[in-house]
Interface confidence: medium
């Protein structure tokens, strides 16, 4: 796995622990929480992400704080179980044995259950609006502006091939990011856009997961875009299933 | 004058399949957040299928895999393919239409008068 | 059954004001999501009257108004009138449905 080799860190993952034990003296670096070995030449999946958060201290974990919306299931945070892979596994349970199924953002999407709970594949999150209200400006950005520099974020920070971004729109002070990725498209080796927007949404909030580098810069023609309110609606392959008891609860 | 008429409202039976249309005038298809919103006797409204501007579609839970939303561009309109129907799945049928702006605000402001699917056993 | 919830029916004199509420929760309004209250009269199909929590399309007069609070949101209309008779809606999206939600509707009955 790549990472810089002169102090052996992970440039797109700070909460990973690197030495130089890989094959030949490389820098290898593994992240908290599950000790898994990760790509430092692409950014770590959300299921790594959100074990390593839970397994920072406490007082540390303020320093890492989920914004508002990150995780968009009403039970907060929790300590997800990932597959080999680092993605999500369907089926996450607690330490009191009540289960559920997820996506592949990890949100649920099911009714609480308990060990005998089946999910049997982990469906895709295929379709990501990221609806963002920026601060009051002198005027407003100009459009063709900010779709070409929010495309070329995603594409320089995050990664993620500009087929993905599907439509960036803006209606002061309004922007929306679509972000598609069916499983049919996903190449091995394309960033996830789940994984892109949780990054993106980080930075947003001033909680960057990159190594050492300054917070998000976001600047259009260098005007500062600031933000003040980030919403996420998640469209998955298959609809989630509730029963009728979760919606009168 | 933006306007949404739909058609194609049937008495059908358990298990059958209809097409719904929502025939579009005074603005295109191709650039709106076009929606299914059902509503059964005397109950309230429960939202069924959108299609976006991109062509992408999503369906309710309750529908998927049963019902199919489409858009035709060259004729305008808007359909929702309605197979394996049940009891339940009787209803007044709208389509409706967000605001125009290019972004998705969740909202539906532009309705048609409705078509009713009469499913019985 | 609703995921938003609504008070089945609400009534008022003529040039009263009356509210309707619609209570949600933190995967609804509760998480910030915008509000949308619709008028259904009699035989017809709803009309959009509040979008966006607090913003009245054109045409609506500005005895409709819109807040929301927490996970709650709430449509007030004043000096009523007879015509104001109708079922009015609520709706958000959901976050842990994934979809486009609406409460189970009041009946509103001007005195």
């Known amino acids: 796995h790549t990472a810089a080799q002169d102090n052996c860190t992970c440039p797109t993952n700070k909460m990973t622990v690197c030495s130089p034990d890989g094959p030949g003296g490389r820098c290898q670096c593994r992240a908290l929480g599950s000790g898994m070995a990760v790509d430092c030449s692409t950014l770590t999946s959300k299921c790594l992400l959100l074990k390593a958060r839970m397994s920072a201290p406490k007082n540390a974990r303020t320093l890492v704080r989920p914004s508002e919306h990150a995780l968009v299931d009403n039970d907060g945070l929790y300590d997800p179980d990932c597959d080999p892979e680092g993605r999500f596994k369907a089926r996450q349970c607690n330490q009191t044995s009540v289960c559920w199924c997820v996506n592949s953002v990890g949100v649920r999407r099911t009714d609480k259950g308990d060990l005998s709970l089946r999910c049997d594949e982990l469906v895709r999150t295929h379709h990501i609006l990221i609806d963002l209200r920026h601060r009051p400006t002198a005027g407003a950005f100009n459009h063709s502006d900010l779709d070409a520099e929010l495309r070329r974020l995603f594409r320089e920070r995050y990664r993620l091939h500009p087929k993905f971004v599907a439509a960036v729109h803006y209606e002061q002070p309004t922007i929306q990011i679509e972000l598609r990725q069916n499983t049919s498209q996903k190449a091995a080796g394309d960033v996830d856009i789940g994984d892109a927007a949780y990054y993106f949404e980080r930075d947003i909030k001033g909680e960057s997961l990159f190594q050492g580098r300054g917070g998000l810069d976001l600047r259009v023609r260098g005007e500062p875009l600031q933000v003040e309110r980030t919403l996420i609606y998640y469209l998955d392959e298959i609809p989630p299933k509730f029963s009728m008891k979760r919606l009168t609860a | 004058e933006v306007q949404l008429v739909e058609s194609g409202g049937a008495l059908v039976q358990r298990g059958g399949s209809l097409r719904l249309s929502c025939s579009a005038s005074g603005f295109s298809v191709r650039n709106n957040y076009i929606t299914w919103v059902r509503q059964a006797p005397g109950k309230g409204l429960e939202w069924v299928a959108i299609?976006?501007?991109?062509?992408?579609?999503y369906h309710a839970d309750s529908v998927k895999g049963r019902f199919t939303i489409s858009r035709d561009l060259s004729k305008n309109s808007v359909y929702l393919e309605m197979n394996s129907l049940r009891e339940d799945d009787t209803g007044v049928y709208f389509c409706?239409?967000?605001?125009?702006?290019?972004?998705?605000?969740?909202?539906?402001?532009?309705w048609g008068q409705g078509t009713t699917v009469t499913v019985s056993s | 059954q609703s995921v938003l919830t609504q008070p089945p029916s609400v009534s008022g004199a003529p040039g009263q004001r009356v509210t309707i509420s619609c209570t949600g929760s933190?995967?609804?309004?509760?998480?910030?999501?915008?509000v949308h209250w619709y008028q259904q009269l009699p035989g017809t199909a709803p009309k959009l009257l509040i979008y966006?929590?607090?913003k009245r399309p054109s045409g609506i007069p500005d005895r409709f108004s819109g807040s929301n609070s927490g996970t709650s949101a709430t449509l007030g209309i004043t000096g009523l009138q007879t015509g104001d008779e109708a079922d009015y809606y609520c709706g958000t999206w959901d976050t842990s449905l994934s979809a486009w939600v609406f409460g189970g509707g009041t009946r509103l009955t001007v005195l």
């Open positions: 966006d929590n607090n």
């Open positions: 409706a239409r967000d605001s125009g702006s290019p972004l998705w605000r969740g909202h539906f402001q532009y």
């Open positions: 933190s995967a609804n309004i509760g998480a910030g999501y915008d």
């Open positions: 299609v976006f501007p991109g062509g992408s579609s």
